[in-house]
């Protein structure tokens, strides 16, 4: 019988008392085979973290800073359940740390030196740790003691709770630096008042502070937010302009064998019986003998944290950067206006080899990081382990939902002004063998399908989106008799046709021979009835253009396209017979790396792009013999995006809507995780 006990860690007598009450009340409402609570008392949150890591306890609720401690080795804990605030219809699990300024003040984030600052309090998250952590490497040396460095950075501050004797400049704007509401500039509202009164130039608070203090929109319009990319935005655009997105209060557990499903089952049942306005005799979110015991008194309920989400992703790149800077106190020696090497994310060992060769030829401007799937690469870019990669539009969508931005687009047509003219896109097509003359778009049910990969544009999002509109369900593996759609569940019929050996079967990388455009076409040639690819795939792999044994004798005339009106056309008539127009592949990165990735990639394509004529004796960035490694092989150049610099603008309204409709069919664990952070 599996042990269904969750050992909750309590950090005080009062918490232990509430825990015992929690345990007893849960016993009274949950059947004996359901989850139960046991209580473990420790002296501090750090002791609780260690106890969970050592399997002496299972769960505890922590503030963001402690979630970071819990994640660090050797603890390796992960977030499993989040408290939410506000309503069930619009649950808030995060708040945003922001930098508020007056509208007419005219400086940016990178011009804060010498300004006057208002903080909620020394050592507090939004008011100190996050802004000072992010500014850490701009502080004058020596950076220890930190208070002295901050005092020398700003021309005057109010940082309640600071030592006014040792660091008088930190108390210059609020004499005495009182650590309570007796100091008019203490806390969120106090820091905002410090800005409003004109004492300070910038206030570090949370996004809701300005709304709580100024009910009138006209008054709020006198203020703006400083963004990390050195722009400003209106105060209601905090989701796109903040210093960090911070989880409020989170239950953590072990990463391996952490009982996360059991903890959720317990807390979900607990909120049903003892949540807000549920029971008089015991209330989860109330602390008669103290404040915020076990859970925050202001919480309204719990939400399950998606399993794909580790602590780094949950806390977010900015927050982790800020806290790491404060804790480790290390800064790069290079001047910050110089670009560091771009860490390119390579999928599996084939791309890694090409990336390594690029790295050698770039003389260190490019470094390489490996991952097994595109989603793993996107996650690495999110958390700073990697910086950039080129993605199919379907993954540009996921990357965008995860906060990444497109920076350059692949162009596939030769033109005089390639780098300045991003193209409208390529065509997603359905290819069949000419010999299968009875096959049309309308009778694909029961046929064998070949896809580039799950989540990709031409191979999945476009054809499956169209199919979904027809069949109104997501069971595509029942619609086709079998197929190869790399990235599907291994036991799915959509992995049956795949050719990868062992663990590589149906993997969404080049270890699976039927992965990608060329792979999907090969799948059609060897086993399938229909392949969903791009309009250039057939000509690129026929007429001897692909020397691989399976392709070298293929003839373009032996294949036809399926049109949406039920007819068929020759391959070259793709402009009048396609499923949809697809946005070109694009390079994505984090917002903070956008300028450097843009600069370095433009240099790299001038050195190794399509201007290189002899690829047998020189490194060619856009060549890998039909394998589309790192970039599509038909890339002519990487083009500027001009104003199409967000994923929505880049992909276009129509495609974003189409992928949004397919979301209900999504198996993307990363998309689920990122949507949790930003619904």
């Amino acid at each position: 019988v599996p042990d269904k006990t969750v050992r909750w860690c309590a950090v005080s007598e009062h918490e232990a008392t509430k825990c015992q009450s929690f345990r007893d009340h849960m016993k009274s409402v949950i059947p004996s085979d359901g989850p139960s609570v046991a209580c473990v008392k420790k002296a501090s949150y750090l002791d609780c973290i260690r106890a969970i890591a050592a399997n002496e306890a299972d769960a505890v609720t922590l503030d963001a800073g402690l979630v970071y401690d819990a994640y660090l080795a050797p603890n390796n804990l992960k977030p499993v359940v989040a408290e939410f605030y506000g309503s069930k219809e619009d649950p808030q699990t995060f708040y945003y740390a922001v930098a508020v300024v007056k509208k007419d003040s005219g400086f940016q984030m990178n011009q804060l030196r010498g300004k006057k600052s208002c903080h909620t309090g020394l050592g507090r998250s939004a008011g100190w740790n996050i802004p000072i952590g992010l500014l850490y490497c701009d502080l004058p040396e020596p950076r220890k003691p930190l208070e002295k460095a901050v005092a020398n950075f700003f021309s005057g501050s109010c940082a309640p709770c600071a030592d006014g004797t040792d660091f008088p400049q930190l108390c210059q704007l609020c004499p005495g630096c009182g650590c309570s509401t007796l100091n008019q500039y203490f806390g969120y509202s106090g820091a905002f008042k410090c800005l409003k009164d004109g004492a300070g130039d910038v206030a570090f608070v949370k996004h809701s502070t300005i709304f709580e203090n100024l009910a009138n929109k006209a008054d709020r319009d006198q203020y703006e937010l400083l963004c990390l990319d050195n722009t400003r935005k209106p105060v209601d655009e905090y989701k796109d302009c903040h210093l960090a997105q911070v989880p409020s209060h989170t239950v953590v557990a072990r990463s391996m064998g952490g009982k996360e499903d059991l903890i959720w089952e317990l807390l979900n049942q607990a909120q049903e019986h003892f949540g807000k306005d549920k029971s008089k005799e015991f209330q989860l979110f109330s602390s008669p003998h103290g404040k915020d015991l076990l859970f925050k008194d202001s919480a309204h309920g719990f939400l399950k944290v998606p399993p794909r989400m580790d602590a780094k992703m949950y806390l977010g790149y900015e927050y982790v950067t800020a806290i790491r800077n404060l804790r480790e106190g290390t800064c790069p020696e290079a001047p910050t206006d110089e670009c560091k090497p771009v860490k390119w994310c390579a999928l599996s060992h084939h791309e890694r080899l090409k990336c390594d060769e690029w790295s050698v030829n770039s003389v260190g401007k490019i470094e390489c990081v490996s991952a097994e799937t595109t989603e793993d690469c996107i996650a690495k870019i999110m958390n700073g382990e990697a910086d950039a990669m080129s993605l199919d539009g379907g993954f540009v969508y996921i990357a965008g939902k995860c906060g990444l931005v497109p920076v350059l687009a692949e162009n596939y047509n030769k033109s005089d002004n390639c780098e300045d003219t991003p193209e409208a896109g390529y065509f997603a097509i359905a290819v069949v063998k000419k010999s299968a003359s009875d096959l049309t778009w309308d009778n694909l049910k029961g046929k064998k399908s070949c896809h580039t990969a799950v989540g990709r544009t031409a191979g999945w999002n476009i054809p499956m989106g169209l199919l979904y509109n027809k069949i109104n369900h997501c069971r595509f593996d029942e619609f086709f008799s079998e197929g190869c759609a790399p990235g599907s569940k291994k036991d799915s019929s959509l992995c049956k046709l795949c050719m990868g050996s062992g663990l590589n079967l149906c993997e969404p990388n080049n270890k699976e021979g039927y992965y990608g455009y060329t792979g999907a076409f090969r799948c059609l040639v060897e086993k399938g009835d229909v392949a969903f690819v791009k309009h250039q795939t057939v000509p690129q792999n026929t007429g001897g253009k692909n020397p691989d044994p399976w392709a070298k004798n293929l003839n373009e005339k032996d294949y036809e396209l399926l049109c949406l009106d039920g007819t068929r056309k020759p391959v070259e008539e793709y402009a009048n017979c396609h499923l949809a127009r697809a946005p070109n592949h694009a390079v994505v990165t984090r917002k903070d790396k956008e300028a450097c990735v843009h600069k370095i990639l433009r240099q790299q394509q001038h050195l190794f792009g399509s201007n290189v004529t002899d690829c047998s004796g020189n490194f060619c960035l856009f060549r890998s013999e039909t394998k589309d490694l790192l970039f599509r092989d038909d890339t002519v150049c990487l083009a500027k995006l001009h104003d199409r610099n967000t994923y929505e603008k880049y992909l276009g309204e129509e495609y974003v809507k189409a992928v949004g409709n397919l979301r209900k069919c999504s198996t993307s664990s990363l998309l689920e995780a990122c949507t949790f952070r930003r619904p």
Epitope: E351, D356, S616, R623, S624, K627, L629
Partner: nanobody
Framework: QVQLVESGGGLVQAGGSLRLSCVAS????????MAWYRQAPGQQRELVAG???????HYADSVKGRFTISRDNAKNTLYLQMNSLEPEDTAVYYC???????????WGQGTQVTVSS
């Protein structure tokens, strides 16, 4: 395709030196990029050092200042001079010429380097 044969490995004390050679069966003069990789037991194969046809070099952070890569096109040979060896350098060392077909996993037998403390 050019065949590559590595040699020069062996057992050496920490702080010692070794020079690895990689002889090609054909001309390397027109080969764009050549490199040394290494693979320790249970680890992924990793890039150690690379050199372009024009002589530009690139090194993994862990070997910078200790290892030197060079090529002699007349002798069709790639070299890796390894100084101040550390136990962490223990691995099988391979050379590659990055043929255009990155996806064809052609590797020689490599040469074992063991650094004892």
């Amino acid at each position: 395709q050019v065949q590559l044969v590595e040699s020069g490995g062996g057992l050496v004390q920490a702080g010692g030196s070794l020079r690895l050679s990689c002889v090609a069966s054909g001309s390397i003069a027109s080969i764009a990029t050549m490199a040394w990789y290494r693979q320790a037991p249970g680890q992924q194969r990793e890039l150690v050092a690379g050199i372009t046809r024009g002589g530009s070099t690139h090194y993994a952070d862990s070997v910078k200042g200790r290892f030197t890569i060079s090529r002699d096109n007349a002798k069709n040979t790639l070299y890796l001079q390894m100084n101040s060896l550390e136990p962490e350098d223990t691995a099988v060392y391979y050379c590659t010429d990055y043929s255009r077909r990155y996806y064809e996993d052609y590797w020689g037998q490599g040469t074992q380097v063991t650094v004892s403390s």
